[in-house]
Structure formats: C-alpha cells, structure tokens
C-alpha cells in the first residue's frame, strides 16, 4: 500500500513557532513497540498455492539493515495435484515501508527517512487479459 | 518479515566521538525515494483466491498518517466455481514496518520511530493439521 507524500507539513513546527534550524529535526533514540513481532503461520511461503522465495538485502547504513524481498516462484498457481496451473497467476503483494538511512562525515552523523518498496509475499489471482490489435 | 532490534548501535556515533546530547539525533527533512510507488496488479484483493478487505487507520501524529490493514474475507479459499473451499485456508501475510511518531509540547517537536505490524494481504495455503490426543 502507498505511503502518501509528506508535503513536509508533518515535520514542520506549528506556524507560530520559529522554523527548524538547518532543515533537520530531533529524532529521539529508541523505537516504540520494538518487541512487536510478526505472528504469521509457519512456512506459508512454501505451503501457498502461489509460493515464493526470499532474498535478503543487507546495508549497514540502513535501519533495518536487513530487508527481505519475496519473489513468486511461478507464473501460475499450484493446483491440488501439485502442478503449476497457468489458468491462474501468482502475483506479488507489495508494501511501501520506511527505513532510516544513516549519513556520516566524521563525527557528524545524521539520519534520513527512505521509502522502500518491499514484496512481502504472493497471492493467486484470476488473470486479466488485454487483447492488443 | 521481522525488523531486528536496534541494539541502539545503529543510532550511536562512533566510539571516538562525543556522545549524542539529550538522547536524540538529527533527522534530515525530506524522504529519499518519496515518489517510488507500489505497482501491484489492479484489484488483486478481489481477484485473489484468498480475497481480503482493507481497513484504513488514521493518526495525524504518525507518518504516514494513513496505515492500511488487510483482513482475509474467508477462512477457506475461493475455487474455480467461485465457492469457498475449506480444504485450503486463507492466511494473512504480515510485515513489520516503521512509522514516525510526532511528539510535541508547545514549540518543542520531536520524533520517534515506531514499529507497526501491517497485514498486507492474504494467500491461500495448504493447512497444517495438528492432531491433539
């Protein structure tokens, strides 16, 4: 799902207040609900009729450093006989998410939000056909 | 997918540098890749064999203010005849994501990262049967 544009109003102080110096804001250390955890069914990526694999990308200057991307294994979906059936299609489910980018020059460290597109898994759909003349 | 614990090392300055004053960091205004957009197939939530509905939650002190949560419509999956087949199960696909929480007291505005669990969509899986003695 989409993250709307900031319009930068979210990060601005109220109009009656002095502006933020140097185009930066104060980010408190620590993460709210840091211990919250995904509680998905086990191995759904293999048990799904639209199975997927995971690829991990790693970047030490990003938080979280590890971002996991899913790739659908098949064009079609897996039928009751365990065969790929192309009358249906496996499609990726995507989500826009935020990460934090770390930028440093010597002892001067700053952070910036970054929007990342994550493919979270796949689902099986009826395909839409377009006929091209 | 999981976001690992910060361990707060990511947000710390190098050991040789003076510590961050007041437990906060500098967050630059603006979002990298802000114009990046989800390019999912249209209406996959209705075309899926494990269809889902969306609920929007709104919080003006969160960025993004709008967070969309999916809920699977059925226990089973929709078969070729358009009927629910309970020999298969619709299951949610979840993703941990970051949002930014805005906290203000008068003209003093600070921000903090918050971890949010988002259900992005649903997929159809072969159920695992546990027999309880």
């Amino acid at each position: 799902r989409k993250i709307p544009k900031v319009g930068h109003t979210f990060f601005q102080k109220p109009e009656s207040c002095p502006p933020v110096p140097g185009g930066s804001m104060k980010l408190d250390i620590g993460i709210i609900n840091e211990n919250q955890r995904v509680s998905m069914s086990r191995n759904i990526e293999s048990r799904s009729t639209s199975p997927w694999n995971y690829t991990v990308t790693w970047d030490p200057n990003r938080y979280p450093s590890e971002v996991v991307q899913a790739q659908c294994r098949n064009l079609g979906c897996i039928n009751a006989q365990g065969k790929e059936d192309i009358s249906m299609n496996s499609v990726p489910i995507q989500q826009e998410t935020l990460v934090v980018r770390r930028k440093h020059q010597g002892c001067s460290v700053s952070f910036q939000l970054e929007k990342v597109l994550v493919t979270v898994g796949c689902t099986c759909v009826t395909p839409v056909i377009h006929h091209v003349q | 997918r999981k976001i690992p614990k910060v361990g707060h090392t990511f947000f710390q300055k190098p050991e040789s540098c003076p510590p961050v004053p007041g437990g906060s960091m500098k967050l630059d205004i603006g979002i990298i890749n802000e114009n990046q957009r989800v390019s999912m197939s249209r209406n996959i939530e209705s075309r899926s064999t494990s269809p889902w509905n969306y609920t929007v939650t709104w919080d003006p002190n969160r960025y993004p203010s709008e967070v969309v949560q999916a809920q699977c419509r059925n226990l089973g999956c929709i078969n070729a005849q358009g009927k629910e087949d309970i020999s298969m199960n619709s299951v949610p696909i979840q993703q941990e994501t970051l949002v930014v929480r805005r906290k203000h007291q008068g003209c003093s505005v600070s921000f903090q990262l918050e971890k949010v669990l988002v259900t992005v969509g649903c997929t159809c899986v072969t159920p695992v049967i546990h027999h309880v003695q």
């Epitope: 064009l75 079609g76 192309i86 299609n89 499609v91 759909v125 395909p127 839409v128 377009h130 | 197939s41």
Partner: antibody
Framework: QVQLVQSGAEVAKPGASVRLSCKAS????????MHWVRQAPGQGLEWMGV????????SSAQKFRDRVTLSRDTSTATVHLEVSRLTLEDTGIYFC??????????????????????WGQGTAVTVSS | DIQMTQSPSSLSASVGDRVTITCRSS??????LAWYQQKPGKAPERLIY???NLQSGVPSRFSGSGSGTEFSLTISGLQPEDFATYYC??????????FGGGTKVEIK
C-alpha cells in the same frame, strides 16, 4: 518459415498411452504459449490444454485433466502431449497451435494478429483393440 | 464456460453465391473471435482475426463482422476452392478456447 511440425501417426490399444510432439521453427519458441486441440473423426474441434514455454506451467480442460500431461523442451523448441488410459473415443487428429499471449503478475497481453494463426499439420491417433 | 453456437451446421450453395455463417456466444466476448477454414485431412487455416480483420493472403471475398455475442463470416462470391468446413473460435476466456460446432459448405 514459421511452422509447427508434428510427430507421425500413432496406433495404440485401449488403456495404453501416447506421447505426441510438436516442433516449432521460424519464430521465438519461448514467446508463444502452445495449445493442443483435438478433432474426433467427422467431428468439430475441442480444446485440450495449453503450456507456457518459459516455466512449463500448464492448464488443461477439466475433462482431460487427470490423464493429459503437457511438457516442453526449450532446447529443441518442442512441446509434448501425453495422453494416458486411452479409450476408443480418443481416436482422432491432434493439433498444436501457437498463441501470442504473455502473462505476468496477473495481467496477460495477447497480440491478436499472431494468436492461433499457425497450426501443426496434425497427428492421427488411432485407438483400437 | 463460454458456449459458441454456430449456424447453420451445413449449407449447400453454388459458385458465385453469397454465403453467411453466424456464431453466437453465450456471453460477451468483445471481438475476441477468429474464423477458420478446414479442408479434409488438413489443419484449420485462419481467415479472420479479431472478428473483422482479414488474415494476410486470404482473398477479400471473405469478411467478418460482429462484436459482443453475435458474429458472422461472409463469403461474397463463393469459389470452388471455398467448399470446406468453417469454424469460429473464441479466445476471450483465458486460457480456455471454445470452438463453434462448424459449418460444412457443400456444392449445390
């Protein structure tokens, strides 16, 4: 020259299996799905199934689903149709035909100018006890 | 599944006649229809695609029309080589293909 060349006639007994082949030439094999159509003696045309060349995914008509296997060999640009548990009603001509459809992520595009335009010459299958 | 009803199932005509064959689909298939000619012992050959487009190399006496659920193939000025069986094919319902029952055009 764009063509589909099918394997020769087959004679089989009831209960046996046959494996037919269809070799593509003159066009990019992996860009076209391949359908199989059969025609019983003096009858009309009946769709059996289709195979997608890249991953080898298939779809078959309900009536054939449990005894038809479609496969492909990209190295030789050939598709195969195997029909098992043959009955006398399986006697007929079996055709392969190309389809210019391309599907990805739930959206398919078919270029109609070269959809179902090229057919194989047909393979005669006779089931007789 | 989409049903294709083709009529007539057979007809007798003379050289030079104007012949029209119709195909009716059980639901809207837009213009996702082709017409084929088949001669005994041969594979079908496409005459018309996308309901009304003439296949390259096919004589202009063949024409197709219609969209939605009603389609027709017209041969204006039947020639001796046109005596054959004609089929319509719908390809709107991916991946399933459905053929009409066929129309045999015979010499009167």
């Amino acid at each position: 020259q764009v063509q589909l060349v099918q394997s020769g006639a087959e004679v089989a007994k009831p209960g046996a299996s046959v494996r037919l082949s269809c070799k593509a030439s003159g066009f990019s094999f992996i860009k076209y799905y391949m359908h199989w159509v059969r025609q019983a003696p003096g009858q009309g045309l009946e769709w059996m199934g289709v195979i997608e060349p890249t991953g080898g995914g298939t779809s078959s008509a309900q009536k054939f689903r449990d005894r038809v296997t479609l496969s492909r060999d990209t190295s030789t640009a050939t598709v195969h149709l195997e029909v098992s548990r043959l009955t006398l009603e399986d006697t007929g001509i079996y055709f392969c035909v190309r389809d210019s459809i391309y599907c990805k992520h739930g959206t398919c595009h078919r270029t109609v100018i070269d959809a179902f335009d090229i057919w194989g010459q047909g393979t005669a299958v006779t089931v007789s006890s | 599944d989409i049903q294709m009803t083709q009529s007539p199932s057979s007809l007798s005509a003379s050289v030079g006649d104007r012949v029209t064959i119709t195909c009716r689909s059980s639901q809207d298939i837009k213009n996702d229809l082709a017409w084929y000619q088949q001669k005994p012992g041969k594979a079908p050959e496409r005459l018309i695609y996308a309901a009304s487009n003439l296949q390259s190399g096919v004589p202009s006496r063949f024409s197709g029309s219609g969209s939605g659920t009603e389609f027709s193939l017209t041969i204006s000025g039947l020639q001796p080589e046109d005596f054959a069986t004609y089929y319509c094919l719908q390809h709107n319902s991916y991946p399933l293909l459905t053929f009409g029952g066929g129309t045999k055009v015979e010499i009167k």
